[in-house]
C-alpha cells in the first residue's frame, strides 16, 4: 500500500534552511485538518522538481512566506 494512502501527514522531516524565492516553482501551505493536526508547508523547487517540507516555525521560512505573499500582492491587480 503506498504510504500516501495510509498516513495523515505528508512531512517526514522538516527543513529549517532558507529557501531562495527565485528557486521556487510552487509553495503549498496545507492548513491543519482532520487528517493532519499541524500546518504543512511544501516547497516545489525548480531544480528537478524536488519537493521539500519547510518548518513553519523557522524564522527563515516565515520570512520566505512574507516575501512570497508580498510578491503575490504586487502581481494582483
Amino acid at each position: 500500500i503506498p504510504l500516501s494512502r495510509t498516513v495523515r501527514c505528508t512531512c517526514i522531516s522538516i527543513s529549517n534552511q532558507p529557501v531562495n524565492p527565485r528557486s521556487l516553482e510552487k509553495l503549498e501551505i496545507i492548513p491543519p485538518s482532520q487528517f493532519c493536526p499541524h500546518v504543512e508547508i511544501i516547497a516545489t523547487m525548480k531544480k528537478k522538481g524536488e519537493k521539500r517540507c519547510l518548518n513553519p516555525e523557522s524564522k527563515a521560512i516565515k520570512n520566505l512566506l512574507k516575501a512570497v505573499s508580498k510578491e503575490r500582492s504586487k502581481r494582483s491587480p
Epitope: 498516513v7 501527514c9 517540507c53
Partner: antibody
C-alpha cells in the same frame, strides 16, 4: 558535529526484551524523521522502522510488526526501539539513521546521517 | 512489498575503470523515491545519491545516478581505491521501505 550514538545492545535469550537508544547531537532532532535499520552478520541492510519528526506516525517492517515499537523523546534528543519477543533471526547490528531534511511522501532525501550501530545477539 | 534486485552480485574491476551497478524494482518506483548507499566493512552505510540522480552533500562528482520506473543505475566514472565497497539501492515510495541485496565492488 552531527552525530548519532546507539546503545543498549547485548546478548539476550529468545523471547526476552531489549530497548535500544539512539542519542542525537549537533542538529535539531525534533525536525527530522528517524529510522532503525539492521544488518544480520554477513548479510545486507534491512529497514526496521520509521517515525515522523513529531512522533505521531510510525511504520514497521513486516518481520518486526507487533513485536518492536519505535518511539522518540524530542526533549531528550533520543530515539528508541523497544524490542519484545526476540528471536534468533533478530540478531544483527542495529543502526539508527536520520531522514534527510525536508523529506516528504512526495520526495525523499535519503538517510543522510547514521550511527555506528549497536549489536544485538539473541541466543540461548 | 517492492523487491529491489541488484546486479551483478559482485563486480571485479581495477582502479581507473568505470563501474555500472544496476537496481531493478519489482514494480514502478518514483525517481524521487530511490537512493544509493555505500558501505565499507565495519562501517555504517553512507548516503551517495537521493532522488535517483542527486548527489548527497560531500559526494564526489565521479558518482552519478540515473533511471526511472523500474530500472536504476549507479555509475562510478573512474574508480578510486576507496570506492571498493558494497553498494545498496533503496526505495521508499511505499511501505515497507526496502533495500536491494547489495553489489560488492572488489579490486580485480
Amino acid at each position: 558535529q552531527v552525530q548519532l550514538v546507539e546503545s543498549g545492545g547485548g546478548v539476550v535469550q529468545p523471547g526476552r526484551s531489549l530497548r535500544l537508544s539512539c542519542a542525537a547531537s549537533g542538529f535539531t532532532f525534533s525536525s527530522y524523521g528517524m529510522h532503525w535499520v539492521r544488518q544480520a552478520p554477513g548479510k545486507g541492510l534491512e529497514w526496521v522502522a520509521v517515525i515522523w519528526f513529531e512522533g505521531s506516525i510510525k511504520y514497521y517492517a513486516d518481520s518486526v510488526k507487533g513485536r518492536f515499537t519505535i518511539s522518540r523523546d524530542n526533549s531528550k534528543n533520543t530515539l528508541y526501539l523497544q524490542m519484545n519477543s526476540l528471536r534468533a533471526e533478530d540478531t544483527a547490528v542495529y543502526y539508527c539513521a536520520r531522514e534527510g531534511a525536508g523529506s516528504s511522501l512526495y520526495y525523499y532525501y535519503g538517510m543522510d546521517v547514521w550511527g555506528q550501530g549497536t549489536t544485538v545477539t539473541v541466543s540461548s | 512489498e517492492i523487491v529491489l534486485t541488484q546486479s551483478p552480485g559482485t563486480l571485479s574491476l581495477s582502479p581507473g575503470e568505470r563501474a555500472t551497478l544496476s537496481c531493478r524494482a519489482s514494480q514502478s518506483v518514483s525517481s524521487g523515491h530511490l537512493a544509493w548507499y555505500q558501505q565499507k566493512p565495519g562501517q555504517a552505510p553512507r548516503l551517495l545519491i537521493y532522488g535517483a540522480s542527486s548527489r548527497a552533500t560531500g559526494i564526489p562528482g565521479r558518482f552519478s545516478g540515473s533511471g526511472s520506473g523500474t530500472d536504476f543505475t549507479l555509475t562510478i566514472s573512474r574508480l578510486e581505491p576507496e570506492d571498493f565497497a558494497v553498494y545498496y539501492c533503496q526505495q521508499y515510495g511505499s511501505s515497507p521501505y526496502t533495500f536491494g541485496q547489495g553489489t560488492k565492488l572488489e579490486i580485480k
